[in-house]
Interface confidence: low
């Protein structure tokens, strides 16, 4: 008997962007303002996620999706679904508890988030620097000396630069 | 003194969901984010995920997505964590852990959790037996 | 997201100083600032000892201390006492929105 009544649940056929009422005989009522239900048959739609303050809205809510939000201009996402936001800083800094603060000697940021990383070691390749290091850029790692000759390769390039706070996912 | 006081020993059969308790005190409860945390017997520690108590947003390990729900009580000053479809491999001690960074309201400001774990519960030990 | 890698022990003398490391990778240990290590005795929560890598809370000893370097991040206890015998972990955010702990590493104290 269970299972015959959940299998004749009338609560099942209630689509997505409407709620099973219970307080009128479970029928589908379309979700209330600022509200959303993604999937059929929910007791109850779900509050619209508010992109407020450092948030901006990326996408409206709709009665059958919650809203997406982003950040606003000198900030950037972290988090999953962007729930937290986390303030830029410029090329060649890092953020710290104490804001932001600028590289120290023999490492670079060339980014506006995550961490100031250290220079490439060229001479661990067997390489020299072609071109020093700053806050915003890596150094350059050119032919070993023994390599400048006539005919020598050319310059190899730095390894292009990772996002550390960017979700690969 | 700042403490969070987890409910005591919960058995359950296979199949079962469980609903943990943290009850938070000495501190602004919506001012911190809390994390949940794992340890199986003779095991190591295991993230679960987080929430912040001031707008109620989560994030979950990919491991539990699906099966486990953070939610909080402000006017109790309460988190919880229910976790579904239990099995075996679920039996653990199940801590709550306040994060070390003093956050904001979610929908106003922004903060990024430390992830440090600076206030811990005494953990609830949850079995899951046939 | 796989679990750091630390040694599953480590043991040293009363005076000595011993240091246990956990690797991890640029997603996490590597790309963030967030490594916390925890110290847990049998039967208790663990208790943060080191946050933000170097950071110590109030309360706990000077003994303990942090560092990091590329994708490897240490904890070294100098002065060992016996009563420094515990589990330790530590633990990252990562580039997935979430947290990693190491597999734990047991300190004896000879």
């Known amino acids: 008997f269970e299972r015959t009544r959940s299998l004749q649940d009338p609560c099942s056929n209630c689509p997505a962007g409407t709620f099973c009422d219970n307080n009128r005989n479970q029928i589908c009522s379309p979700c209330p303002p600022n509200s959303f239900s993604s999937a059929g048959g929910q007791r109850t739609c779900d509050i619209c996620r508010q992109c407020k303050g450092v948030f901006r809205t990326r996408k409206e809510c709709s009665s059958t999706s919650n809203a997406e939000c982003d950040c606003t201009p000198g900030f950037h996402c972290l988090g999953a679904g962007c729930s937290m936001c986390e303030q830029d800083c410029k090329q060649g800094q890092e953020l710290t508890k104490k804001g932001c603060k600028d590289c120290c000697f023999g490492t670079f940021n060339d980014q506006k988030r995550g961490i100031c990383r250290p220079w490439t070691n060229c001479s661990l390749d067997g390489k020299s620097v072609l071109v020093n290091g700053t806050k915003e850029r890596d150094v350059v790692c050119g032919p070993s000396p023994a390599d400048l000759s006539p005919g020598a390769s050319s310059v190899t390039p730095p390894a292009p630069a990772r996002e550390p706070g960017h979700s690969p996912q | 003194e700042v403490q969070l006081v987890e409910t005591g020993v919960e058995v359950k059969k296979p199949g079962a969901s469980v609903k943990v308790s943290c009850k938070a005190s000495?501190?602004?409860?919506?001012?911190?984010?809390m994390h949940w945390v794992r340890q199986a017997p003779g095991q190591g520690l295991e993230w679960m995920g987080i929430?912040?108590?001031?707008?109620?947003?989560?994030s979950y390990a990919q491991k539990f997505q699906g099966r486990v729900t953070m939610t909080r009580d402000t006017s109790t000053s309460t988190a919880y964590m229910e976790l579904s479809s239990l099995r075996s491999e679920d039996t653990a001690v199940y801590y709550c852990a306040r994060d070390l960074g003093e956050g904001y309201d979610f929908w106003s400001g922004y903060y990024t959790p430390s992830g440090a774990f600076d206030i811990w519960g005494k953990g609830t030990m949850v079995t899951v037996s046939s | 997201q796989s679990a750091l890698t630390q040694p599953a022990s480590v043991s040293g003398s009363p005076g000595q100083s011993i240091t246990i490391s956990c690797t991890g990778t640029?997603?996490?240990?590597?790309?963030?600032?967030?490594v916390s290590w925890y110290q847990q005795r049998p039967g208790k929560a663990p208790k943060l000892i080191i946050y933000d890598v170097t950071t110590r809370p109030s309360g706990v000893s000077n003994r303990f201390s942090g560092s990091k370097s590329g994708t490897t991040a240490s904890l070294t206890i100098s002065g060992l006492q016996a009563e420094d015998e515990a589990d330790y972990y530590c633990?990252?955010?990562?580039?997935?929105?979430?947290?990693?702990f190491g597999g734990g590493t047991k300190l004896t104290v000879l």
């Open positions: 929430i912040n108590p001031s707008g109620g947003s989560t």
């Open positions: 633990s990252s955010y990562t580039s997935y929105s979430t947290w990693v």
């Open positions: 640029s997603s996490d240990v590597g790309g963030y600032n967030y």
């Open positions: 000495g501190y602004t409860f919506t001012s911190y984010y």
